[in-house]
């Protein structure tokens, strides 16, 4: 379900990634240099920026981030 409207709830931040708010709603997600072989699974729909550099992701399936706008 959708998360309630609140100023005190943190948006979903994938394990081991670093996250930083981007304005009132959005989230910048830095998952660089984590040795990932696939995309992080619990990305917030409010992700405005995603850094996956310096990982081991060799291929992406079609529409790999369906939850993102």
């Amino acid at each position: 379900g959708s998360s309630p409207r609140s100023g005190v709830l943190l948006r979903g931040c994938p394990t081991h990634c670093h996250c930083e708010p981007d304005g009132r709603m959005l989230l910048r997600v830095d998952c660089s240099d984590l040795g990932l072989s696939e995309l992080p699974s619990n990305l917030s729909v409010f992700t405005s920026y995603l850094d996956l550099s310096m990982n081991n992701i060799s291929q992406l399936l079609p529409n790999p981030l369906p939850s993102l706008r």
């Epitope: 100023g7 005190v8 709830l9 943190l10 948006r11 708010p21 304005g23 009132r24 959005l26």
Partner: antibody
């Protein structure tokens, strides 16, 4: 710089109501939520509720519904919390604090509320 | 409500020590954890959000880690100005809840 100004202390009688104020400056008041937190002497922190000054939307901790009412006056960039039917259990320090995307980045100095006859 | 537990209510350490303060949630909070510092005069400051993101102006000797239900705040080189009470807070679901606090004292 960001400032949240709260009165240092309030003394009220049991059964009465009190309206605590929190005057914000140094930022755009309607761009941030305002949180209210209670701390009893020697105790931890307890979230009371929050208000979005842009449209006065509120969320309350179920425990404080009927006890606390949050409002804002955007013309003076001031947030208020009214506490009703006061008892000694309401004696505490009350903090206002602003938040954005899930974390509370600036806190007021707190108002010490004493309920005593 | 999610319960946040800081098992150590007070901690004594020497200046220069590496200090770790732990916090446990009653359920998985998916890294949605903040740490706050409360000075003896009551002043409260944000240290860390999103489990590990240092707030602007916070010294780099502070760091946060953990996952799932278990999280920790580490001060790598304790200074006099760090003497305070430290609270964790979950931002996973309403109502947000705080740990009981860990009071840090100088040995």
């Amino acid at each position: 710089q960001v400032q949240l100004q709260q009165p240092g202390a309030e003394l009220v009688k049991p059964g009465a109501s009190v309206k605590l104020s929190c005057k914000a400056s140094g930022y755009t008041f309607t761009n941030y939520w305002m949180q209210w937190v209670k701390q009893r002497p020697g105790q931890g922190l307890e979230w009371i509720g929050e208000i979005d000054p842009s449209d006065s939307y509120t969320n309350y901790n179920q425990k404080f519904k009927g006890k606390a009412t949050l409002t804002v006056d955007t013309s003076s960039s001031t947030a208020y919390m009214q506490l009703s039917s006061l008892t000694s259990e309401d004696s505490a320090v009350y903090y206002c604090a602003r938040s954005l995307s899930g974390y509370v980045d600036y806190w007021g100095q707190g108002t010490t509320l004493t309920v005593s006859s | 409500d999610i319960q946040m537990t800081q098992t150590t209510s007070s901690l004594s350490a020497s200046l220069g020590d590496r200090v770790t303060i732990s916090c446990r949630a009653s359920q998985d909070i998916s890294n949605r954890l903040n740490w706050y510092q409360q000075k003896p005069d009551g002043t409260v400051k944000l240290l860390i959000s999103y489990r590990s993101r240092l707030h602007s102006g916070v010294p780099s000797r502070f760091s946060g880690s953990g996952s799932g239900t278990d999280y920790s705040l580490t001060i790598s080189n304790l200074e006099q100005e760090d003497i305070a009470t430290y609270f964790c807070q979950q931002g996973n679901s309403l109502p947000p809840t705080f740990g009981g606090g860990t009071k840090l004292e100088v040995r």
